[in-house]
Amino acid sequence: SDKLYQRKEPVISSVHTKVKGIAEVTENVTEGGVTKLGHSIFDTADYTFPLQGNSFFVMTNYVKSEGQVQTLCPEYPRRGAQCSSDRRCKKGWMDPQSKGIQTGRCVPYDKTRKTCEVSAWCPTEEEKEAPRPALLRSAENFTVLIKNNIHFPGHNYTTRNILPTMNGSCTFHKTWDPQCSIFRLGDIFQEAGENFTEVAVQGGIMGIEIYWDCNLDSWSHHCRPRYSFRRLDDKNMDESFVPGYNFRYAKYYKENNVEKRTLIKAFGIRFDILVFGTGGKF
Amino acid sequence: SDKLYQRKEPVISSVHTKVKGIAEVTENVTEGGVTKLGHSIFDTADYTFPLQGNSFFVMTNYVKSEGQVQTLCPEYPRRGAQCSSDRRCKKGWMDPQSKGIQTGRCVPYDKTRKTCEVSAWCPTEEEKEAPRPALLRSAENFTVLIKNNIHFPGHNYTTRNILPTMNGSCTFHKTWDPQCSIFRLGDIFQEAGENFTEVAVQGGIMGIEIYWDCNLDSWSHHCRPRYSFRRLDDKNMDESFVPGYNFRYAKYYKENNVEKRTLIKAFGIRFDILVFGTGGKF
Amino acid sequence: SDKLYQRKEPVISSVHTKVKGIAEVTENVTEGGVTKLGHSIFDTADYTFPLQGNSFFVMTNYVKSEGQVQTLCPEYPRRGAQCSSDRRCKKGWMDPQSKGIQTGRCVPYDKTRKTCEVSAWCPTEEEKEAPRPALLRSAENFTVLIKNNIHFPGHNYTTRNILPTMNGSCTFHKTWDPQCSIFRLGDIFQEAGENFTEVAVQGGIMGIEIYWDCNLDSWSHHCRPRYSFRRLDDKNMDESFVPGYNFRYAKYYKENNVEKRTLIKAFGIRFDILVFGTGGKF
């Protein structure tokens, strides 16, 4: 609450997060022309990345393009990309939607469709929908430990969200355990009024707000965090503005003296930890 | 503008960026002693890295040291590093400029020069100039979509820079489309009075400032962002303070049961998105 | 100092860091059943990662689990994980502490102990202590160059911590060179009253605070940074809250057409650069 006689100072904050959990992923895998059911385990090293403190990412879904190599191939026949003759293909042209540079030839993509030939990582990425349900939908049960150290330099005051009295096997609950800093990902979504299973398909951004309203006067000292949650990406966003949250990364390797890569389009939840508040003192 | 009767509150912000574009890179490649012109396509997975929201990096140039292995070799003969006898080389010495630990021996680097032998990733990185013009100079035509969600918790007000009425095929222009949040990288540099082609060689840091000056009173409500751009690294910086922007990373692999790496010195532009402003309400 | 007649504005900041140094690492390496002393050199590409400006990480220790493959194996026999019959193992159960999903069978881990069989990356990670002393303990002698560009947009004022008059071969010292922005990592710890050698084992988080108290009035202009250091992680933290600072990442590769990975548990120091302060003008 506003105490006008106090000297207010904004919080200086540092955050450290630790995600726990394993996911079992079942998907169709094609090897040597034969498609069978593949089963694999994802642990933290597989689904998360060493990121900065104020943000962490949990992969919940993915699309892989395996064995890509730099060569010539027909581009993916997305809407408006098909051709019937070389006239439709312009040598040196880079379509922002495409993944390569046109050679000027119109070539067969499959038995029924022709597209412009491109110099690219081939075969080019298929523009297929993210798997539904999400492959790592069980990430809903992962937990994240959030450690937050705060400082009011002007008041020479430092504290943290985890106190020595806290129990390391707790789980945050708005009513029963509002000071526990171990959060189940599904609970964060529930608190924000969002459906984890749904968001996991395309990905999204979730805000974890930590509000410190600190009264540093010795006679009425109070300085504990309050946690709240809200979705930060726009779920109603138009296709053209790239809804959800995804990024592409590659694993490179050599085979038969040719550099190859596996391209992974990773969908997931980026959690942004937004720390704010003030310290007031007479 | 300052309305003294209003209660002002700083903005809480979350940013999400998405870079688009492909670059055609032509460079000399040596294979089996034969040098020929190499040509490759770089897409987002090749030139950018999954980074936090408030910053993104676009690689514009690089120098590769391929096939390095942990062994003994002569260090690179940079200024002041040459020797004529073992006396000049101190066993166990690590020169901060060097890439290894001296064995105490002075050995031939090539037909004319001798340097201290080091235990290092060998052959050691050559201290050669970044290629000019930059290999990915066409990154000037890449575009970045910036999504910014802001919150004034005290006023319980949230908004974002992208409105439902916006057109996903727009490009930001200071006069004609100042609310469009898709930016051509070359335009950002032009607005900041900088030369992309020049900066792309050594790399640099570019600030994209998003200023929210929000009047949240219902009778004169206004809350839209204003974009501006400024270069953040010092282009006149002394050599000793490492001008530009680059970092080294490695790709590790095994060959004939020996661990090897390819070292990449990546030059590029780091874009920092700096969101600031206040929300005022009576 | 507070000048009440001035209009104060918080600082907008951008940071760029550059770490220098090489470490010599000696450890036991097992190859083909034979254990021998291994010796390797780590340079920046090996011990640090391309991170955002406000944070950088230096690996000081690690534990490797090599040649893991997705299959079935006994889980690690940590406290409370042993079994004597299948009844103790629940098919489909994922213990948050474990690294896999139970099959329901109790199988021999070694000659004396049995544990539940899991579907996981096998062999599962051994829960062994971080090496002591830390493998990259010599990181104490690494240096970091910190470049900080600040802006007070309301006052249209920009400056940086590195001035043209500065000497690129300086090292920060609180008394003798308090404006030098090249810091020896060991000195940062000493200034913060911490023992680098000790923290390097388990890792930790170190804050580098840069305080700008700027008087922008022309008649008494002053705007230079003040550096201070404090440890941000809780060294007295209970085991259950994961003391220190570490994360796991993996290097994936194929062998005999089987995907394998090397899991690295990296311990190290995350340095958070916390920039704050105000610019005041009449």
């Epitope: 064995g67 890509q68 190599v69 730099q70 060569t71 010539l72 191939c73 040598k91 040196g92 540079i101 050679t103 000027g104 030839r105 030939e117 110099s119 081939c122 075969p123 085979e255 038969n256 040719v258 190859k260 | 055609e24 032509t26 020929k36 012109l37 040509h39 | -």
Partner: nanobody
């Protein structure tokens, strides 16, 4: 001038094996897709098998399981291992390659062909 030269053809008994080889020589930037086609007397040329630079393969139904196409990217060579040969495999086998002479300058090249005869 870029050339494709085939070898390895000949006369073989039904059920036997042959290995065809085709090498690209000359000055060029990159060899992309490579393939083997065949033409039997009085019939149209048909695709036998093709292989991308990334080693993805595709076979005609009539040879699937019997023939194997492979390539060596150092030597710019494509191979066709033919097992379980049948009399109906008798034809002139020609090598095809899509080669970039310079950057974004691809052209289609054909070899002269090599005769394969399978006797019953």
């Amino acid at each position: 001038e870029v050339q494709l030269v085939e070898s390895g053809g000949g006369l073989v008994q039904a059920g036997g094996s042959l290995r065809l080889l085709c090498a690209a020589s000359g000055s060029f930037f990159r060899v992309n897709n490579m393939a083997w086609y065949r033409q039997a007397p009085g019939k149209q040329r048909e695709l036998v098998a093709d292989i991308t630079r990334g080693d993805r393969t595709n076979y005609a139904d009539s040879v699937n399981g019997r023939f194997t196409i492979s390539r060596d990217n150092v030597r710019n060579t494509v191979y066709l291992q033919m097992n379980g040969l049948k009399p109906e495999d008798t034809a002139v086998y020609s090598c095809y390659a899509r080669i970039e002479l310079g950057i974004l300058e691809p052209r289609d090249y054909w070899g002269q062909g090599t005769q394969v005869t399978v006797s019953s």
